[in-house]
Interface confidence: low
């Protein structure tokens, strides 16, 4: 019998134990300051910096600022420890300085929209610019009192780093105020102005009737033809043409705080829910291996994804590279970065029926117009951190 | 060619548990949603509980909630119905069925509640 | 949970005749319907799905037509190999359900 331990799995020091309840078969006992399954990655160092109710603490974006907390369940704040804001128009109302609040329903549950005055035009009617709010733009935390489009969305930080979500939408169409409000604004109804959110299409929802159906075979590798349109996520591109090779296709790599006791059933959520909010089939990756490609961050392998630069001081045998990790990690919450396959054969110009996000680019600007006005975080199963859109390659010529 | 083996049925006494198991062939099993599908004697067909491809997902008809556990195995092609607390109203042919249009059948295996 | 309820329960026909059962659903369930076909002593056969999306195999003179709430299994000519019993069943939303059946029977 092969003896797991055996190819010492076990990086920076850490014992590995053969035991059969482990899907690897093995599990490593790490030393301080790294984790992971095979204690490939470095824990991020919190210090006195602790994150409650099962938030993540992460490394900061920004060399020397603190670490941040991504916090779970609706808590926010730098510890977590701000309770979730109520569904809806609360009370308290989540509208500042005197706007008034009207209740929406969407695929999250009840939300809300702000009618704000002009002095204080954010999405929850902040003041750009606001006292308290400067040196807090681009710490990777989003402030929701310093987030609007004069401010940039808090330097980015409350739209997934992307400084302005509806640049080259006319500002005067305030196109950003109306994004997702579930009425269509035919102004902001073009690529520029990111669709309306996609306010004005019809039918805005897969019909009761399909949804289950199309929830059960969402990419599962046979087109369900029912399933097949933009509504319905597009089967999780099921359908999509077979020319060309779809592991060299446009993909995301997302940065996701995940729960890994039910990391799979958290995976579909998040590729259903994202195909049916941009709609554009979304899928989990697979590398050559079969694997899916899901992995621990922080990590080496997981800021490659994300198109990061290698912290050089940082060592790792070569093999954790070549594999997808972290599936197993035995913590409540855990960041990874998880790569989607995006069919995009439906959009574009010569799909005018169909209107969606033709590039990874858009479909990025997409989201974070999505997350500066507060429509994101209720649809996911764990806070999205950033996103990296890659545009797709060739696949390399054969070497004979 | 498709195939599914069910197997595991037989005479049991009320309150008393029995697994049932669906061996299948011809397919990539891990691929597709499973189901299974009972038939009292005379009667019509039931959904007693189904599950999704990698297991993540289950539903289970009301009538039995909290006495059976579906399960599946997809490194050995099998699926499993562990029922508990049986009741002479399980009684029945139980079928395993692919998917939600049940394209494939098993040949069913009975099961008999019966003091 | 949505009924699926058949007519008639059981009828006679002669061979050649032109055989309609219908089901009618609760509430909408779309086009996700699928229709069963079950000979004495054997195993379910699935014959039409998505409504009216034949199943590989089945005999073009088995046809399915509606959506919503009302639909219909269609044998344009019927043949003393379709004595059977035919079921209709949703899957637009749990539990899946199955009409209580329709035994057709050769005059």
């Known amino acids: 019998e092969i003896d797991p331990c055996h190819s010492q799995p076990c990086f920076h020091g850490g014992t590995c134990e053969a035991t059969a309840g482990s899907p690897l078969g093995f599990i490593c006992h790490c030393p301080k300051g790294f984790e992971g399954p095979t204690c490939s990655h470095r824990a991020p160092s919190c210090g006195f910096h602790h994150c409650h109710h099962g938030g993540l603490c992460l490394p900061s974006p920004k060399p020397g600022f603190p670490p941040r907390c991504a916090c779970l369940s609706g808590y926010g704040g730098p510890d977590c420890l701000t309770p979730p804001a109520p569904k809806g128009c609360g009370p308290p109302s989540p509208c500042l300085y005197n706007g008034s609040c009207s209740e929406t329903t969407g695929l999250g549950g009840p939300g809300f929209r702000c009618s704000c005055p002009h002095s204080s035009p954010g999405p929850r009617c902040q003041k750009p610019g606001a006292k308290g709010c400067e040196g807090r733009s681009g710490d990777g935390a989003c402030d929701a009192g310093c987030s609007g489009p004069g401010g940039n969305w808090d330097g980015g930080d409350c739209s997934l780093g992307v400084p302005d979500p509806w640049k080259g939408c006319p500002s005067h169409s305030r196109c950003w105020l109306l994004f997702r409000d579930g009425q269509c604004h035919p102004q902001c109804d073009s690529e520029e102005c990111l669709f309306d959110g996609y306010d004005c299409e019809t039918p805005p929802a897969c019909t009761p009737a399909y949804d289950q159906y199309c929830h059960d075979h969402f990419h599962n590798g046979h087109c369900e033809k029912g399933c097949n349109t933009a509504e319905c996520g597009w089967d999780g591109g099921d359908c999509r043409p077979e020319d060309g090779d779809p592991e060299w296709g446009p993909s995301l790599a997302l940065l996701v705080v995940l729960s890994p006791p039910a990391l799979d059933q958290q995976l579909f959520a998040l590729a259903r829910v994202l195909s049916l909010t941009l709609r554009v089939g979304l899928w989990v990756r697979k590398d050559r291996d079969g694997r899916d490609m899901v992995y621990p961050y922080p990590g080496a392998r997981a800021e490659e994804k994300l198109g990061g630069t290698r912290d050089p001081t940082y060592q790792e045998r070569a093999a954790p590279q070549t594999q997808p990790l972290g599936k197993e990690t035995d913590s409540l919450s855990a960041g990874f970065v998880v790569v989607m396959g995006v069919d995009l054969s439906r959009c574009g110009p010569d799909h005018p029926a169909s209107r969606c996000p033709w590039d990874p680019g858009l479909l990025l600007r997409f989201l974070a117009a999505m997350a500066a006005v507060g429509a994101l975080e209720p649809l996911l199963p764990g806070p999205l951190l950033a996103v990296h859109p890659h545009a797709g390659t060739a696949p390399p010529a054969n070497q004979l | 060619e498709v195939q599914l083996v069910e197997s595991g049925g037989g005479l049991v006494q009320p309150g008393g548990s029995l697994r049932l198991s669906c061996a299948a062939s011809g397919f990539t099993f891990s691929s597709y949603g499973m189901s299974w599908v009972r038939q009292a004697p005379g009667k019509g067909l039931e959904l007693v509980s189904t599950?999704?491809?990698?297991?993540?997902?289950?539903y289970y008809a009301n009538s039995v909630k909290g006495r059976f556990t579906i399960s599946r195995d997809n490194s050995k092609n099998t699926l499993y119905l562990q029922m508990g607390s049986l009741r002479a109203e399980d009684m029945a042919v139980y079928y395993c069925a692919r998917d939600q249009g049940f394209a494939y059948w098993g040949q069913g295996t009975l099961v008999t509640v019966s003091s | 949970d949505i009924q699926m309820t058949q007519s008639p329960s059981s009828l006679s026909a002669s061979v050649g005749d032109r055989v309609t059962i219908t089901c009618k659903a609760s509430?909408?369930?779309?086009?996700?319907v699928a229709w069963y076909q079950q000979k004495p002593g054997k195993v379910p056969k699935l014959l039409i799905y998505w409504a009216s999306t034949r199943h590989t195999g089945v005999p073009s003179r088995f046809s399915g037509s509606g959506s919503g709430t009302d639909f219909t299994l269609t044998i344009s000519s019927l043949q003393p190999e379709d004595v059977a019993t035919y079921y209709c069943q949703q899957y637009s939303s749990y539990p899946w359900t199955f009409g209580q059946g329709t035994k057709v029977e050769i005059k």
């Open positions: 509430q909408d369930v779309g086009t996700a």
């Open positions: 599950i999704n491809s990698n297991g993540g997902r289950t």
